[in-house]
Amino acid sequence: YHGCPSECTCSRASQVECTGARIVAVPTPLPWNAMSLQILNTHITELNESPFLNISALIALRIEKNELSRITPGAFRNLGSLRYLSLANNKLQVLPIGLFQGLDSLESLLLSSNQLLQIQPAHFSQCSNLKELQLHGNHLEYIPDGAFDHLVGLTKLNLGKNSLTHISPRVFQHLGNLQVLRLYENRLTDIPMGTFDGLVNLQELALQQNQIGLLSPGLFHNNHNLQRLYLSNNHISQLPPSVFMQLPQLNRLTLFGNSLKELSPGIFGPMPNLRELWLYDNHISSLPDNVFSNLRQLQVLILSRNQISFISPGAFNGLTELRELSLHTNALQDLDGNVFRMLANLQNISLQNNRLRQLPGNIFANVNGLMAIQLQNNQLENLPLGIFDHLGKLCELRLYDNPWRCDSDILPLRNWLLLNQPRLGTDTVPVCFSPANVRGQSLIIINVNVAVPSVHVPEVPSYPETPWYPDTPSYPDTTSVSSTTELTSPVEDYTDLTTIQVTDDRSVWGMTQAQSG
């Protein structure tokens, strides 16, 4: 194939791949008709003048995972057809000015996972056709004004995993075609008003894992096409009332891991396309009426691991499409009987690790499609008559780790549980707490005659005496849970990352066998 170096493999499709620790310089001679060249996992430490001079037809050049620390300014001379250049995962600290001169066709430039300390406007001034610029995983502390001014066609810019402490409001002003901007895992403490005003076509903005404390009220007002906004793991303590007002296309918003103390009514919206809202790990103490009322299409709402002690009866107004509601690990003591009434499509509700001491009898009255209810680790002593009667699809009910009072009042619940044991799972059953003489005994098999009779004896016709048969051949056991949300974690999935670490967010939903507080 027009002379393939011994250290490389060359395919008929004009693709050359050179790998291995024994390679210490760009192999020669390279086939003149090569269109794709990959130099991976070698011990090359520098690129000298014009090592690719004779392969001017090259379209894609990947020089990744090497020891590369120095590049001569003329290293890429004569590569006028090059569209894709990756220098990712090397040891570059400095880019010579003019390095990309003459690369008039370049569309993708990957400089991620190096040790770059700074970039200058002159670095990219010749790259007017660039569509994608990856700079994540470097040591950049600031971006000078003008750095991207010539990249008017840029659609994707990744500056994540650097050491940026502030951003100039002018640095992105000419990037009107930008669709994806990633600034995650930096040290940003605030973002000046107007920073994103020029980004009228922006679809994704990733700001997670910074130290942002405050959002300017109009920060996103020009980003009408924004679909994904990642604000998780910052220090945001309050949301200005209008901050999300003009984001009609938004379908993903993550705010978990902040310091939010309250949510004002109407703060979210209108966002007709938002399907998931992740608010776990904040300091929210109450939910007022209509706080989510603009989120008509919301299907997943995660409010776990906050300090919620009060939910207004109309807090969930408007959430008619909601399927999953996670309220576990809060400070709830009481719930209004109407609080879930509007959630006609709710399938899974997670209320474990709260302080609930009783539930209203009508709490699930309008939520006929419930399939999973997590009530473990509360302070429930009994449940109202017929609370689960109408829940024909219920296949998972967790009631363990509550101080069940096994007097004669518990009989109706005990009888219903006896007939519906499969719903409880086999691993962890509810046990009596009082009276002391039956403490620790299974609520399902307890002989209530042994227990102390209650003050008033209820009329016995109570929980339905019809056995429950699952709709499907098998029902979930206690180790694997029916909740789909358990698998729908807010993983911010970036295809340009070398490795994507998907964290298991089961503890966020809290639907694991042993709860972790």
């Epitope: 400070a331 003591q333 009481d334 474990q352 690790n353 302080r355 001491r357 009783q358 473990q376 680790n377 302070q379 363990y400 780790d401 101080p403 962890t428 046990v431 707490f433 009082s434 009276p435 002391a436 403490r439 620790g440 005994q441 066998q513 042993a514 709860q515 972790s516 507080g517």
Partner: antibody
């Protein structure tokens, strides 16, 4: 006879971790919850957390990021794992349970405690 | 978190006299539906582990002498030892379990 016996205390370096055990007898961990409480010398009681019969846990919010409570029912043992120790964690560590009391968070049976000293 | 504040820090009472210890919580411990105050008192004698005396503000634990009584509701609670005995010398702690438990700082009771 109901008994709770703590062990695993001793001298720990700052920044290190500890794993305390609470061996129980006279009752089953599948039926009763076990709390951990600590007390610095000459100071008051501080509730650390609890593991309930079914395995659910609750933690003191100020210490939650450093604490893990677990148990092995078959071994009748409850464990307290604490990371990133500092001098302020020097204390007597107790485990306790609610054997007779009607108070769900009441602690009417206590171990004798195990002493943890954090020092270089 | 709910903060429990005890007063006084220490108290010296003659044998046979009444001892009164106060405890104030930063928020109400009364649950309106169960009508219970989630408040308890513990006694810790020198060199010993703590002992539960009273829960739900006024319910004496089994085996606790009737000279110990608890009272109060909402945010203000009192432990009274009607006739102090030598064996009552101890530190007394209040505790709330309305939210996750927190203890008061303790009151040391000595004989005058």
């Amino acid at each position: 006879e109901v008994q709770l016996v703590e062990s695993g205390g001793g001298l720990v370096q700052p920044g290190g971790s500890l794993r305390l055990s609470c061996a129980v007898s006279g009752f089953s961990l599948t039926s009763y919850g076990v709390h951990w409480v600590r007390q610095a010398t000459g100071k008051g009681l501080e509730w650390l957390g609890v593991i309930w019969a079914g395995g659910s846990t609750n933690y003191n919010s100020a210490l939650m990021s450093r604490l893990t409570i677990s148990k092995e029912n078959a071994k009748s043992s409850v464990y307290l794992q604490m990371n990133s120790l500092r001098a302020g964690d020097t204390a007597m560590y107790y485990c306790a349970t609610h054997m007779i009391t009607e108070d769900y968070y009441g602690m009417d049976y206590w171990g004798q405690g195990t002493t943890v000293t954090v020092s270089s | 978190d709910i903060v429990m504040t005890q007063s006084p820090d220490s108290l010296a009472v003659s044998l046979g006299e009444r001892a009164t210890i106060n405890c104030k919580s930063s928020q109400s411990l009364l649950n309106s539906r169960t009508r219970k105050n989630y408040h308890a008192w513990y006694q810790q004698k020198p060199g010993q582990s703590p002992k539960l005396l009273i829960y739900w503000a006024s319910t004496r634990e089994s085996g606790v002498p009737d000279r110990f009584s608890g009272s109060g509701s909402g945010t203000d609670f009192t432990l009274t030892i009607s006739s102090l005995q030598a064996e009552d010398v101890a530190v007394y702690y209040c505790k709330q379990s309305y939210n996750l438990p927190t203890f008061g700082g303790g009151t040391k009771v000595e004989i005058k």
